[in-house]
């Protein structure tokens, strides 16, 4: 199809090359054409204009995206030659940053039911770029938690060394719809809560003396638990004796539990001590038992093949730790009578 | 640092055979789940198989039954994915993943798996 026609717009990522980050093309069809066909329409069907441009399918699947080789080639269908692009709904998803990613994008509806719908297309030019060095060093990061129940802000990398007051006017978008409220380079969330995780989408106009370019970063955004402030506690073994038989097998179970923690390294291991000795026991590996929002319950036990008169003077010890600190519960064991 | 490194994947025809690997390192226990999840051209992430480090049972999607098993070594701390009979579109990139605190929070970089003539 003839692409002179399609609207075209000008985008520039440019990525840091110490972080893993996403970008995203939307297919900004003219509106109204893109709220109808991509499900952005604010009217109520009593509102609905007499005649639309391009009156679309109403699967949000039904968007075709199109790369245009820079040599001159036919058109190229994403889905078949990029596996590193995803489409989502109106959505073009580039997993992986890179300089190869710069060329023209076109999107355009699978289902032509129009003469009008012929132009319905857009053509977006993609300039990727890796940061120079000189540009900001301590840019806001591509993945930023907020905290839930407290207050927090997502900010824009590419403006985030500038103060609000020079800062130009962003556009942003959460999962691919306009925040129409938003026009800083900071959005400040008074209180968190689960559903302001996801993908957001900054957007502020760079020009020169030729033309003006759209600067693009994404920013995925999640929520979390904030990191606890106690140490591991444990659950069992609960008393500190167990009666025993002896010349039987036995295994202790030490189980405790782990509050939340963003870098997770939690130590939970059996150790003997027999008078003035004390060592580390092999054991088997520790398992995760049951893991919510808010903490891990991790089990460890200590095997014994038989259980001898020695190890009735011996305390089995079982030690927790986080990085708040550490716990121990240990156990002596008793002969059963009778 | 936690880490999960994939690899196994690769070009194969349909009906063919490949045994995806995931290596787990930095971990000071076993995570409750670990899953192996995909993501095609196109396409949302979904979850393909899933293993209980506890019960050892597993969970495949509808699509995959029958024809992939997931399975985990916890000596050599690997998790595992045979994948039989393999389809055109079983072709995405694979990414294995562990759960820790309510969620799979901790995942690989992925591994392509092509399915073609």
């Known amino acids: 199809f003839n692409i002179s026609g399609c609207s075209t717009k000008k985008l520039l990522w440019t990525y840091s090359t110490r972080s893993e980050e996403e970008f995203v093309l939307f297919c900004d069809l003219p509106e109204p054409q893109k709220s109808h066909f991509c499900h952005r329409n604010r009217l109520s069907p009593k509102q609905v204009p007499e005649h639309l441009p391009f009156m679309g399918s109403n699967d949000l699947s039904d968007v075709q995206w199109y790369q245009q080789p820079s040599n001159g080639d036919p058109l190229e269908d994403i889905r078949k030659s990029y596996p590193h692009i995803i489409q989502d709904k109106c959505t073009l998803h580039f997993l992986t940053p890179g300089v190869n990613n710069s060329g023209s994008y076109i999107c355009r509806p699978k289902m032509i039911k129009s003469p009008y719908d012929v132009a319905c297309c857009v053509k977006m030019i993609l300039e990727v770029k890796p940061q120079t060095n000189a540009s900001c060093e301590y840019s806001a990061s591509h993945k930023q938690d907020l905290l839930l129940g407290s207050t927090g802000s997502i900010s824009c990398p590419s403006l985030s060394c500038q103060s609000d007051a020079q800062s130009p006017a962003v556009t942003w978008y959460k999962n691919g719809k306009l925040l129409s409220v938003e026009r800083s380079n900071r959005i400040v969330v008074d209180e968190v809560y689960d559903y302001h995780q996801g993908t957001y989408v900054c957007d502020y106009t760079q020009s020169d003396t030729v033309s003006s370019w759209t600067v693009r970063a994404v920013v995925q955004v999640r929520t979390i638990v904030g990191d606890t402030k106690l140490k591991p506690d444990i659950l069992d073994p609960v008393e500190d004796t167990l009666e025993v038989e002896l010349g039987k097998p036995l295994t202790i179970s030490c189980k405790a539990r782990f509050g939340f923690e963003r870098v997770f390294n939690p130590v939970i291991k059996w150790y003997i001590k027999d008078s003035d000795l004390e060592w580390e026991v092999s054991v088997p590996e520790a398992k995760s038992i049951k893991s919510t929002l808010k903490d891990e319950i991790i089990e460890r036990n200590i095997i014994l093949e038989k259980v001898t008169q020695r190890d009735l003077r011996r305390k089995f010890v079982c030690f927790v730790q986080n990085s708040i600190g550490n716990t121990t519960q240990s156990v002596q064991l008793k002969e059963k009578r009778g | 640092e936690v880490q999960l490194v994939e690899s196994g994947g690769g070009l194969v025809q349909p009906g063919g055979s490949l045994r995806l690997s995931c290596a787990a390192s930095g971990f000071t226990y076993i995570p409750a789940y670990m899953g192996w999840f995909r993501q095609a051209p196109g396409k949302e992430r979904e979850r393909v198989a899933s293993i209980s480090s506890t019960e050892g049972s597993t969970t495949y999607a509808d699509s995959v039954k029958g024809r992939f098993t997931i399975s985990q070594d916890n000596s050599k701390n690997t998790l595992y994915l045979q994948m039989n009979s393999l389809r055109p579109e079983d072709t995405a990139v694979y990414y294995c993943?562990?759960?820790?605190?309510?969620?799979?929070?901790?995942w690989g970089q992925g591994t392509l798996v092509t399915v073609s003539s």
């Open positions: 993943a562990a759960y820790q605190f309510g969620a799979f929070r901790v």
